[in-house]
């Protein structure tokens, strides 16, 4: 029985050659976090796995910081970094959480952050 | 629970288009996932040919993008693959399937395809 | 494209025996491989994910492992029922790549 729910930061906009911090927060379950993975439709950007510790992609290993916490720092953005983002919580005995974060990149100077909501 | 169900032609002509459908019943394909087409030739190889996500957009293999297009009717619940210029290399066993993040977690049973004049 | 080895064609054993395929990634995948089974006439079916996650309702004799580019599958007690091809997918990027396969046969 899967209870927890996943809350991330929604959606965000951000300025172009900027940061941003994706963030999820799993709560209402006891479960073990074994790996979070931080992922796009087409690929993996990382991996934060309990026993082997950090993974960055290759492709993102210049712009990509792990963390604060389980999150992922998005560096030096560009406007096609705009997109949908996935945080993927491994769990045990649960299963796997997922939560969705709607990135927009923005050329102007108004960059205003979105609320926060829940996906259960 | 999902399924999907492949159909298509069985038989087409080299230098000829290529289409099948999935239909897919049990969950909307706009709701979640990645709805991909797989195919395994004989000798039981799989290729990845390529899907489309649940708000619309594609993906395709590289060694095919030329060739293929991913479609779908939301209304019908149906996603679709179109192959142009076929040749015999194109014989298979083509599968639609479910996946969420490049993993295929439910497939279909599989429709024959053989490219032949 | 990242390409996936399975370096046994075919593999022999028998019943209540413990048995591991193996799958080599050309390049560091991290933990983004899945496992799937095909049994003769059927389509495919996923049982591991993300290296060593059992799919909803997988028996737990299945088991996954395995990091970076070297990755395990194993039946800890082979059950006629498991007589069938086994093949690894890298889930790291598109395109998707699976191994040619390993066809477990009885000795």
């Known amino acids: 029985m899967m209870t927890g729910t996943i809350e991330t930061t929604g959606n965000i906009s951000a300025e172009k050659g900027g940061s941003i911090i994706l963030q999820c927060h799993l709560s209402s379950t006891t479960a073990q976090v074994t790996q979070v993975n931080w992922e796009q439709q087409d690929q993996l950007l990382a991996i934060c796995n309990a026993d082997l510790g950090w993974h960055i992609s290759p492709s993102f290993k210049d712009r990509v910081a792990p963390g604060p916490g389980l999150g992922l720092t998005l560096q030096s953005l560009t406007v096609n970094d705009t997109g949908e983002y996935f945080c993927i919580y491994h769990t045990y005995p649960d299963g796997t959480y997922t939560g969705r974060i709607f990135l927009e990149v923005l050329e102007s100077s108004v960059a205003e952050h979105g609320a926060r909501f829940q996906i259960p | 629970d999902v399924q999907l169900q492949e159909s298509g032609p069985g038989l087409v002509k080299p230098s000829q288009s290529l289409s099948l459908t999935c239909t897919v019943t049990?969950?909307?394909?706009?709701?979640?996932?990645?709805w991909n087409w797989i195919r395994q030739f004989p000798g039981n190889k799989l290729e990845w040919m390529g899907y489309?996500?649940?708000?619309?957009?594609?993906s395709y293999n590289p060694s095919l993008k030329s060739r293929i297009s991913i479609t779908r009717d939301t209304s019908k619940n149906q996603f679709f693959l179109q192959l142009n210029s076929v040749t015999t290399e194109d014989t298979a066993t083509y599968y639609c399937?479910?996946?969420?993040?490049?993993?295929?977690?439910?497939w279909g049973q599989g429709t024959t395809l053989t490219v032949s004049s | 494209d990242i390409v996936m080895t399975q370096s046994h064609e075919f593999m022999s054993t028998s019943l209540g025996d413990r048995v591991s395929i193996t799958c080599k990634a050309s390049?560091?995948?991290?933990?983004?491989v899945a496992w799937h089974q095909q049994k003769p006439g059927q389509s495919p079916k996923q049982l591991i994910y993300?290296?060593?996650y059992r799919y909803t309702g997988v028996p737990d004799r299945f088991t996954g492992s395995g990091s970076g580019t070297d990755f395990t599958f194993t039946i800890s007690n082979m059950q006629a029922e498991d007589l069938a091809v086994y093949y690894c997918?890298?889930?790291?990027?598109?395109?998707?790549?699976f191994g040619a396969g390993t066809k477990l046969e009885l000795k």
């Open positions: 399937a479910r996946g969420w993040f490049r993993r295929p977690d439910y």
């Open positions: 049990g969950y909307s394909i706009t709701s979640d996932y990645a």
């Open positions: 489309i996500i649940y708000s619309g957009s594609t």
């Open positions: 390049q560091d995948v991290s933990t983004a």
């Open positions: 993300s290296a060593s």
């Open positions: 997918q890298q889930h790291y990027s598109v395109p998707l790549t």
